[in-house]
Amino acid sequence: IAAHVISEASSKTTSVLQWAEKGYYTMSNNLVTLENGKQLTVKRQGLYYIYAQVTFCSNREASSQAPFIASLCLKSPGRFERILLRAANTHSSAKPCGQQSIHLGGVFELQPGASVFVNVTDPSQVSHGTGFTSFGLLKL
Amino acid sequence: IAAHVISEASSKTTSVLQWAEKGYYTMSNNLVTLENGKQLTVKRQGLYYIYAQVTFCSNREASSQAPFIASLCLKSPGRFERILLRAANTHSSAKPCGQQSIHLGGVFELQPGASVFVNVTDPSQVSHGTGFTSFGLLKL
Amino acid sequence: IAAHVISEASSKTTSVLQWAEKGYYTMSNNLVTLENGKQLTVKRQGLYYIYAQVTFCSNREASSQAPFIASLCLKSPGRFERILLRAANTHSSAKPCGQQSIHLGGVFELQPGASVFVNVTDPSQVSHGTGFTSFGLLKL
């Protein structure tokens, strides 16, 4: 069971990143699915290595003082959402914006029907060029 | 099937990074090989988690305006090269240069004879000190 | 065999990061253990994908000229410590400090009784907020 999906620019104002089965994507079988373009949902309980990569372009003067944060989050049936992993990068002083890449990854127990998704502080700063931003998992 | 190889400084002007089976490297068996010191080639079709880490030292004034980009690329028999993953980091203002580390990783389907390699925008900026720059894969 | 542990702030002055089985941690069975809150120790020989993520907040003026370095290290029974992976990030010019995240990961052969741990140049700069700093492994 494995998946690798590709970032998709979105007009939605939500902080949850959007993904698509396009380009060189992976969706090994129907035991993992991409739902609503925003979350990977698994049908089998078990340990999964889950990862995300986010490339963004931001400028210190044009952004809030808070850093750019990417969060890998979990929603299990009947449970609250919870943060699994986060990464933070202070905005660049480069103009018009400076690019930076974040990589998140870790091993987590998922229940049947659990979904994982990626949140960012400012989706408009995310880079969607080939290979820059992706999201995936593999069952151990 | 798994491999982990170590960066090697090269006098070649190519943007493709060079690697060696030295230090604490891994080459599990002959189903994965390091070819010409530049690409990992697999004999078996399947899903692989492929990763690379690149540490580099650069300075904004001494570099082009474009960021430092590391790309994980795929060459399958009879197919064009394609980019699997990229990461970008704007150059540092630190002098003489500022170090930054990039990590790339994802799950991809590889065909028999497929090769993966790592490209960077400026190989002269890559750090080859122990553990700083490496490349590997594992078959799921 | 898999583990994922969560960073813990420590009053110790050691450069070795401290970890805990808390929050959304993973400890699959007793073939991997967290020892003294500082190292993951495996009982079985084999290939492991080992990873660490470290988020830190530092300022160029308040720090040494050297970058922030995170090292993934190995101690095998009867052998000296050795470095598996390192990442380096130059300190930010942001005030009071600028956050940055480092991700390390690779495939390594571990012997029975081998321990892996994470060293940083300045533990006081490490961020321990939810999900920011973690450490884990999985047996292939």
């Epitope: - | 030295k22 230090g23 000190g129 122990t130 | 970058p67 370095i69």
Partner: nanobody, 117 residues
């Protein structure tokens, strides 16, 4: 061409001290971690100590811990090994090397340290 030139060896009594130096040229010294290794008469190479590019992180073999100190001066492209409380078993040819013991691609011609009364 990469060159590593060790100096500072000699004859010293047990309990005495020596400071070894290694002058590096032909590569960007600050871009590499460095090691000291030694070879006792009739024995194999033994790793002694390691230092990172900036002198922030160091490692020592158990046999020398607390007695030897590795350091570097990047402005002078020089690596040092301060050896205190020397013992007869420290007698060896000492080499400096680029990177770690498993990875060294270059090392010098060595300097002989003899500890004897």
């Amino acid at each position: 061409e990469v060159q590593l030139l060790e100096s500072g060896g000699g004859l010293v009594q047990p309990g005495g001290s020596l400071r070894l130096s290694c002058a590096a040229s032909g590569f960007t010294f600050i871009a590499y971690d460095m090691s000291w290794v030694r070879q006792a008469p009739g024995k194999g190479l033994e790793w002694v100590s390691w230092i990172d590019e900036w002198g922030l992180q160091t490692y020592y073999a158990d046999s020398v811990k607390g007695r030897f100190t590795i350091s570097r001066d990047n402005s002078k492209n020089t690596l040092y090994l301060q050896m205190n409380s020397l013992r007869a078993e420290d007698t060896a040819v000492y080499y400096c090397a680029k990177k770690t013991p498993e990875e060294f691609d270059y090392w010098g011609q060595g300097t002989l340290v003899t500890v004897s009364s």
